[in-house]
Amino acid sequence: MACLGFQRHKAQLNLATRTWPCTLLFFLLFIPVFCKAMHVAQPAVVLASSRGIASFVCEYASPGKATEVRVTVLRQADSQVTEVCAATYMMGNELTFLDDSICTGTSSGNQVNLTIQGLRAMDTGLYICKVELMYPPPYYLGIGNGTQIYVIDPEPCPDSDFLLWILAAVSSGLFFYSFLLTAVSLSKMLKKRSPLTTGVYVKMPPTEPECEKQFQPYFIPIN
């Protein structure tokens, strides 16, 4: 009899999510009878966020009652496989990666939520979820078909300090420019109106009706 399990996980993700509880129940009940292997399911494709963070769920149908599980994320590129991160956890406890690991994760039953941080465009590739039931014996190995993670580097964004310096420089420049402009304008005006200018007051004809016998003075500059 063929080994019943998750074949290539190419179904739409929403469909996989909807049918998963039933599938998991089926495997938990029947795998010990049909197949002495562990099967691991993970999404086919994930797009990393603009901050270089990618998250995906790794689920496994366990053929045994393990108390100690090891989860490893592998990256496959050009048939070369490298370890990205690994964590061992006791069932019911939290998944803990090493402090310097680029991975974080949480576990819930036979499901592990994995997050990989610090990804760049060059890190685009196939990320394989490997699950090992370490204890008690027998040991079981489960390898997922991999999640293709696409990472797109954002346009280089200058940091806030740099922006502040630019803003300060532009503001200062504008201030000095306006100050200079004002100074030049004032100096031109002052040159036009010399302090030695003399003039005479003359009586002008009335601008108001005849009844008002008032005269308006008018200053006439004499060059």
Epitope: C3, F34, A37, T72, V81, E83, L141, I143
Partner: antibody, heavy 118, light 108 residues
């Protein structure tokens, strides 16, 4: 260069003990499961034992359980197999092998011969 | 324990011929966890195929693996003089790790 080199084999009387060593180089030792596999003269391959990563988990073949102990020293990049209460049927070439990240035995040592004879 | 049975025990062929080796499991093995090894006299085994069909690093493309469930096959498309050796299949999905008894490919 990834390499495994076994040592410690020899001729020993039934009921006696022997310790095999396997020195590893060229890879991150603690990231891999390490196995001992043996091959009796003119026979096929038989898996003997495995030790995982930090050494906290070990599994043995039924034929050696209770007599053989697998251990590792990650600081020295060395794998060991302590063989007690040896029997004539334990006569074989003993290989250490590194499990690949995807599970198969991708790197093997050259082997060391253990002969149990009175 | 998963028992692997290889056939034939010995295969007598000439260089340039096609070799087909069979490995049958006592119970279903996921194709992700089946490997093939080559062993020459006085040497350690060498990994040829893992995951039933993926060639290991440096293995020529005349070697190919296939199969699923309980039946697996190793095919050598054109035998070269250096291919005459003993071939073992192995399952590594669960403990105990088990090997087939081997198929010897000899020169006719």
């Amino acid at each position: 260069q990834v390499q495994l080199v076994e040592s410690g084999g020899g001729v020993v009387q039934p009921g006696r003990s022997l310790r095999l060593s396997c020195a590893a180089s060229g890879f991150t030792f603690s990231s891999y499961g390490l196995h001992w596999v043996r091959q009796a003269p003119g026979k096929g391959l038989e898996w003997v034992a495995v030790i995982w990563y930090d050494g906290s988990n070990k599994h043995y073949a039924d034929s050696v359980k209770g007599r053989f102990t697998i251990s590792r020293d990650n600081a020295k990049n060395t794998l060991y197999l302590q063989m007690n209460s040896l029997r004539a049927e334990d006569t074989a070439v003993y290989y250490c092998a590194r499990g690949a990240l995807l599970g198969a035995f991708e790197i093997w040592g050259q082997g060391t011969m253990v002969t149990v004879s009175s | 324990e998963i028992v692997l049975t290889q056939s034939p025990g010995t295969l007598s062929l000439s260089p340039g011929e096609r070799a087909t080796l069979s490995c049958r499991a006592s119970q279903s093995v996921s194709s992700s966890y089946l490997a093939w090894y080559q062993q020459k006299p006085g040497q350690a085994p060498r990994l040829l195929i893992y995951g039933a069909s993926s060639r290991a690093t440096g293995i020529p493309d005349r070697f190919s693996g296939s199969g699923s469930g309980t039946d697996f096959t190793l095919t050598i498309s054109r035998l070269e003089p250096e291919d005459f050796a003993v071939y073992y299949c192995q399952q590594y999905g669960s403990s105990p790790w088990t090997f087939g008894q081997g198929t010897k490919v000899e020169i006719k």
